[in-house]
Interface confidence: low
């Protein structure tokens, strides 16, 4: 979290594998079309992906982060890099995809335990447990509170995706940001190609859900570049 406002989460340089030498990322991201990114134990290719140059995180999508793709992490050319999904290695909160955060070098769901130390959620319950345990994490319950804070529901104003409930991400809507549904298989997604295109996107879509990536729809391969339709597809 690492991390406060806006756009969220991605990988700057990959951490070394367990037991690996410090300072040497586990992999580098190719800047060529057909960009390789780590997805579990093997690399996966995103069809016809054009690296999107950026200077600020805000120029990248909600499932990306602006960073150098080089091993050394030199500033130089920066592009939008894919965030790390749940159970993948990380070094800081922003490397993890929206709805996750970095705990002990692994991206975990922010529904379980968010940010530094344990999350304390103030919630109202109708029964008398002062302390209940969920998923192995202590969750403090304040019965006397009239106000209670839950994760933002669809349409709620947010600043980043960890503020939204599971299955939602924080995305731009006009000049604000609200919780929107994470995209499902077959839904249209946005793959940015031109510098500046993010700035024009006042109705921002969420990223594709777990196990999905934003690719050109198969029957649109022959279409012109400008009209290619991207959808969330299984890896």
């Amino acid at each position: 979290t690492l991390n406060s406002v806006l756009n969220s989460n991605a990988i700057k340089n990959l951490p070394p594998p367990l037991g690996g030498a410090a300072g040497h990322p586990g992999s580098a991201v190719s800047a060529a079309p057909g960009i390789l990114y780590p997805g579990g134990n093997k690399y996966q290719t995103i069809d016809n992906y054009q690296p999107y140059p950026c200077a600020e995180d805000e120029e990248c999508g909600t499932d990306e982060y602006c960073a150098s793709p080089t091993r050394g992490g030199d500033a130089g050319v920066q592009i939008c890099l894919a965030c790390r999904k749940r159970r993948k290695r990380c070094m800081r909160h922003a490397m993890c995809c929206p709805g996750n955060y970095c705990k002990n070098g692994i991206c975990v769901s922010s529904d379980q335990n968010h940010f530094r130390g344990e999350i304390e959620e103030t919630i109202t319950e109708s029964f008398g447990n002062d302390h209940s345990t969920l998923d192995g994490y202590s969750r403090r319950t304040t019965l006397s509170s009239k106000m209670y804070h839950t994760k933002g529901q669809e349409g709620s104003v947010c600043l980043r995706s960890s503020d939204c409930a599971s299955g939602l991400c924080c995305a731009r809507h006009f000049w604000s940001k609200i919780c929107k549904p994470v995209l499902k298989e077959g839904q249209v997604c946005t793959k940015h190609r031109r510098k500046g295109s993010h700035g024009l996107e006042i109705f921002q879509r969420c990223y594709c859900g777990e196990g999905l990536s934003c690719r050109i729809q198969k029957d649109h391969h022959q279409a012109s570049n400008s009209s290619r339709l991207h959808t969330c597809q299984r890896h």
């Epitope: 979290t1 690492l2 991390n3 406060s4 406002v5 806006l6 756009n7 700057k12 340089n13 951490p15 070394p16 410090a22 300072g23 040497h24 990322p25 600020e56 995180d57 805000e58 992490g73 500033a75 070094m91 800081r92 909160h93 922003a94 070098g105 922010s110 968010h114 940010f115 530094r116 999350i119 304390e120 959620e121 103030t122 804070h149 839950t150 994760k151 933002g152 600043l159 960890s162 503020d163």
Partner: antibody
């Protein structure tokens, strides 16, 4: 002027309670994660607690977990730290600090600090 | 837990000299490192974030470099007001500080 102004420190006996306040001005308070960092006499900086913009997520260091409670009131541009069961080792200058908007864990605006002394 | 080790503990230099402060992380932290300056009786001030970016209002004589586990704060030509304690930090973890004193 962008600033954080603190109040609420003082002398308290071990086992006692104290509430620190931090009031923001010059920026949109509700856009930021805000933190408490402390510094014991002659020692270095120690992160204590942090809270997100809508109070939905709060973090605590192991040394204060279960004793301190962080909260905020965005309508009043205010941050609070309720400190209970205070110990001698909690004696320190306490700072509130704003995390940078696109957060990388860096605190760019700090309060002036308030001294908490726990002693019998 | 990340441990940040700063060296030297104390650095004695004269105005106009170049200061080089080191910070080593116990784990790989990419380039997400911050540097703070603190003078006696004052709150810390952010100098550098993301290892090499100067914070607003920080003079150009301050520069940061490094990534991975080894980081450096350089003050190209010391001014009298630069003598203070400097901390490196990654998220909530702070180094123990380097005291920069006038020789």
């Amino acid at each position: 002027e962008v600033q954080l102004v603190q109040s609420g420190g003082g002398l308290v006996q071990p086992g006692g309670s104290l509430r620190l306040s931090c009031t923001a001005s010059g920026f949109t308070f509700s856009n930021h994660w805000i933190h408490w960092v402390r510094q014991a006499p002659g020692k270095g900086l120690e992160w204590v607690s942090g809270i997100n913009w809508n109070s939905g997520s709060r973090g605590y260091s192991d040394s204060v977990k279960g004793r301190f409670t962080i909260s905020r009131d965005n309508a009043k541009n205010s941050l609070y730290l309720q400190m209970n069961s205070l110990r001698a080792e909690d004696t320190a200058v306490y700072y509130c600090a704003r995390e940078r908007p696109v957060a990388t864990g860096a605190f760019d605006i700090w309060g002036q600090g308030t001294t908490v002394t726990v002693s019998s | 837990e990340i441990v940040l080790t700063q060296s030297p503990a104390t650095l004695s230099l004269s105005p106009g000299e170049r200061a080089t402060l080191s910070c080593r992380a116990s784990q790989w932290v990419s380039s997400y490192l911050a540097w703070y300056q603190q003078k006696p009786g004052q709150a810390p001030r952010l100098l550098i974030y993301d290892a090499s970016n100067r914070a607003t209002g920080i003079p150009a004589r301050f520069s940061g470099s490094g990534s991975g586990t080894d980081f450096t704060l350089t003050i190209s030509s010391l001014e009298p007001e630069d003598f203070a304690v400097y901390y490196c930090a990654w998220q909530e973890f702070f180094g123990q500080g380097t005291k920069l004193e006038i020789k």
